[in-house]
Amino acid sequence: KFSKQSWGLENEALIVRCPRQGKPSYTVDWYYSQTNKSIPTQERNRVFASGQLLKFLPAAVADSGIYTCIVRSPTFNRTGYANVTIYKKQSDCNVPDYLMYSTVSGSEKNSKIYCPTIDLYNWTAPLEWFKNCQALQGSRYRAHKSFLVIDNVMTEDAGDYTCKFIHNENGANYSVTATRSFTVKDEQGFSLFPVIGAPAQNEIKEVEIGKNANLTCSACFGKGTQFLAAVLWQLNGTKITDFGEPRIQQEEGQNQSFSNGLACLDMVLRIADVKEEDLLLQYDCLALNLHGLRRHTVRLSRKNPIDHHS
């Protein structure tokens, strides 16, 4: 229930967050599950624990395994598991599928590629970006905060993009790389007031308590490439990031698709371990562009799992 997969490359920094939640003030102890050996907190160690974070500085293939984190609240100790796999660096340029983060899509005027997991690290701009192992050069490429913007995207821009940055820990620098695929949808067209295809207005979505649930906000904005089009989720009228519930997260970046020639965006809201309290919230799918904003509201209802008796 409280388990998470993480991966990295040998000789790079890897930072993993405990899948079990808790207040920042809570002590978190980490153990290597196979041996039940405590992970030290002293930063002089190559692998050490720092609150909710487990740091491999740098990582080694032998570090692979399951790590247990115990969040010590004032009442109970709460346990989570991090399944860590460290891979050897490839000698050739190909990045294997098991090292790839989720694919993102873009178009001529919507070409952000986010650098995965970067928020866990202590890094300073700018990021370095590579496409198919070649450093990106030229004015079309702009590294902005934690993402890459490509101006005047062309179909040839599709490929595997790697972000590389330096994690700094007590004056020591460690390299981190993360790779994801970028696909291009390029069309000329027109722009319309946003049309939300899903969810339907005032839709009731049935969810099972204790299970994970996904809500997709999908909207179309016209034909071809779109300028300043976005979809996002709000909870009780508040941005997901400001709502402060780590179990409820938007999928990083926006996936672009083309439906019957229309340019559409979708944003997935992931709710982990659905709780009864989630049914009380108002979920708003927002679609906006230069023409204006449209909002569809969803509420969750409890789906009682069917009991199967022999």
Epitope: G22, K23, S25, P74, I209, G210, K275, E277
Partner: antibody, heavy 121, light 106 residues
Framework: QVQLVQSGAEVKKPGASVKVSCKAS????????MHWVRQAPGQGLEWMGT????????VYNQKFKGRVTMTADRSTSTVYMELSSLRSEDTAVYYC??????????????WGQGTMVTVSS | EIVMTQSPATLSLSPGERATLSCSAS?????MHWYQQKPGQAPRRLIY???KLASGIPARFSGSGSGTDYTLTISSLEPEDAAVYYC?????????FGGGTKVEIK
């Protein structure tokens, strides 16, 4: 919706024991620790302890240690609080209560209706 | 244990006035929760994690503070706000409540 329904009022003699029940519904019972808080007439709130229904683990306020026992029955989604060696100062309303999101200990969001326990000779 | 001291014990104000309730902890705590209790009812969570408004609570209630000193503010009192208000810490075992502040509406 989340509901905590407690057993009815009790009148006990000094030295006796009382067992108060709290039946939970509207959420997965093992997902949230259950706490017990009491309130003497005209007085403030006092935390007695908590139980993790998943493991049966308990944490008690030292003040009640040795006298209080909290248990959970997963088959009926019910927690129990038993207080022994009752004295007149144990006369109070006893509440079961739980946090909104368990891991974040974000205050007691849900409360039972309370059970009045009167200790009198 | 951490002792929570609330002041004043009683606050008597007119509708529309601003109410400021204080809670002082004997040792620094990370967060404070606030509850409202009316006669014959169970307490109701108002503010959690120092400043977050609980679901269904009017925006006239707000919380602030850090360390040992915390405040619950009711910006403009309504007649239905007459109640006893409790602060509570969840930083240390045993969890403890303040003695309460009674708010009376003139």
């Amino acid at each position: 919706q989340v509901q905590l329904v407690q057993s009815g009022a009790e009148v006990k003699k000094p030295g006796a024991s009382v067992k108060v029940s709290c039946k939970a519904s509207g959420y997965r019972f093992t997902d949230s620790e259950m706490h017990w808080v009491r309130q003497a007439p005209g007085q403030g709130l006092e935390w007695m302890g908590t139980i993790d229904p998943e493991t049966g683990g308990t944490v008690y306020n030292q003040k009640f240690k040795g006298r209080v026992t909290m248990t959970a029955d997963r088959s009926t989604s019910t927690v129990y609080m038993e207080l022994s060696s009752l004295r007149s100062e144990d006369t109070a309303v006893y509440y079961c209560t739980r946090a909104f999101y368990n891991d974040f200990d974000d205050g007691f969001a849900y409360w039972g209706q309370g059970t009045m326990v009167t200790v009198s000779s | 244990e951490i002792v929570m001291t609330q002041s004043p014990a009683t606050l008597s104000l007119s509708p529309g006035e601003r109410a400021t309730l204080s809670c002082s902890a004997s040792t620094s705590v990370s967060y404070m929760h606030w509850y409202q209790q009316k006669p014959g009812q169970a307490p109701r969570r108002l503010i959690y994690d120092t400043s977050k408004l609980a679901s269904g609570i009017p925006a006239r209630f707000s919380g602030s503070g850090s360390g040992t000193d915390y405040t619950l503010t009711i910006s403009s009192l309504e007649p239905e706000d007459a109640a006893v208000y409790y602060c509570q810490q969840w930083s240390s075992n045993p969890l403890t409540f303040g003695g309460g502040t009674k708010v009376e509406i003139k």
